[in-house]
Amino acid sequence: QERRFQLEGPESLTVQEGLCVLVPCRLPTTLPASYYGYGYWFLEGADVPVATNDPDEEVQEETRGRFHLLWDPRRKNCSLSIRDARRRDNAAYFFRLKSKWMKYGYTSSKLSVRVMALTHRPNISIPGTLESGHPSNLTCSVPWVCEQGTPPIFSWMSAAPTSLGPRTTQSSVLTITPRPQDHSTNLTCQVTFPGAGVTMERTIQLNVSYA
């Protein structure tokens, strides 16, 4: 015996591969104080949840660690957080509040998640002019990456002498000391999203001035 409620907002959400999306969900205001249950997000047609706060329930291997139920009954929050989105996450999902002690549960309407190809590319920023024999810091950044996702792997490729500087979840610094012969050569920053198995890169030509 189920009681239905409507998810607020759009009927579908779009996310790019490797990135994050929040599927909004609010518990029904008709939920009585006496209903203490666990929350479960399901892929349409599946019996095993993709995310839950039930300590005794297994979740699908495919979504473990990437899908999280953001459970806060005080604020009526039952949203689903998806990180490291993969193509096979492309599906319809619904939320269910259930207690084995109670006859009825609460089931939400369905919401479709559409996973698109990653179109964002890394940015490479160069502070001013590159001077031969002088070290400069180049930054490769992916500001569109969400903090809670698996940190991307940055790789730099250049013929010029380089050393790696500090990195964050969203950026990597490369210290380059160019030589005259490095003028017009390529420098590439490659960013791999291990959670989704997607790689993006940006290549620039070095413009080296002589001291």
Epitope: Q1, S34, Y35, W71, D72, R74, K100, W101, M102
Partner: antibody, heavy 114, light 107 residues
């Protein structure tokens, strides 16, 4: 009006049995899990047992496991607690409550003494 | 089993005082914590459910807060009818344990 009324308490000798009842009214009893909670004289509240809406799931406190049995008859809107092998430490006021514990009965007193 | 501890075990206060009672769980119970008031010879009464939601009909001077393992019940301005024993209880999982109680009496 939502109401729970316990009955069946009394004085019983150690080792004997007693069955408590809890009559429910004013709500759809068959949709709710139910609890038994007890309170020894001058002591705090102790959760005893819970039963699901259809009786298929039951769980007991370690202190009563194997001796007490929780059951229900949805056709009679009644919750039961069968207490066997009673001990002096089972002396308490026994309350029934709905699953959310927002509705309680007034309690029935069980005294285990020789 | 999840153990709940309450502090203080008893306190003396005056009408109008702000009273704070804490409840600590032996493991994280998210926000599955409830608070009850019990007066001598009476059944317990639900005050707060899901750590901070005020039960219907309960005066707004009662409030709850906390999540995980540490929770607080606050009475903003103690009234004569508030002198009672207060219990926390977790509904995270079986067994559904209660705290030992905090008795609030008149100073």
């Amino acid at each position: 009006e939502v109401q729970l009324v316990e009955s069946g308490g009394g004085l019983v000798q150690p080792g004997r049995s007693l069955r408590l009842s809890c009559a429910a009214s004013g709500f759809t009893f068959s949709s709710y899990g139910m609890h038994w909670v007890r309170q020894a004289p001058g002591k705090g509240l102790e959760w005893v047992a819970v039963i699901s809406y259809d009786g298929s799931n039951k769980y007991y406190a370690d202190s009563v496991k194997g001796r007490f049995t929780i059951s229900r008859d949805n056709s009679k809107n009644t919750l039961y607690l069968q207490m066997n092998s009673l001990r002096a430490e089972d002396t308490a006021v026994y309350y029934c409550a709905n699953y959310g514990m927002d509705v309680w009965g007034k309690g029935t007193t069980v005294t285990v003494s020789s | 089993a999840i153990r709940l501890t309450q502090s203080p075990s008893s306190l003396s206060a005056s009408v109008g005082d702000r009273v704070t009672i804490t409840c600590r769980a032996s493991q994280s119970i998210s926000s599955y914590l409830n608070w009850y008031q019990q007066k001598p010879g009476k059944a317990p009464k639900l005050l707060i459910y899901a750590a901070s939601s005020l039960q219907s009909g309960v005066p707004s001077r009662f409030s709850g807060s906390g999540s995980g393992t540490d929770f607080t019940l606050t009475i903003s301005s103690l009234q004569p009818e508030d002198f009672a024993t207060y219990y926390c209880q977790q509904s995270y999982g079986t067994p559904f344990t209660f705290g030992p109680g905090t008795k609030v009496d008149i100073k």
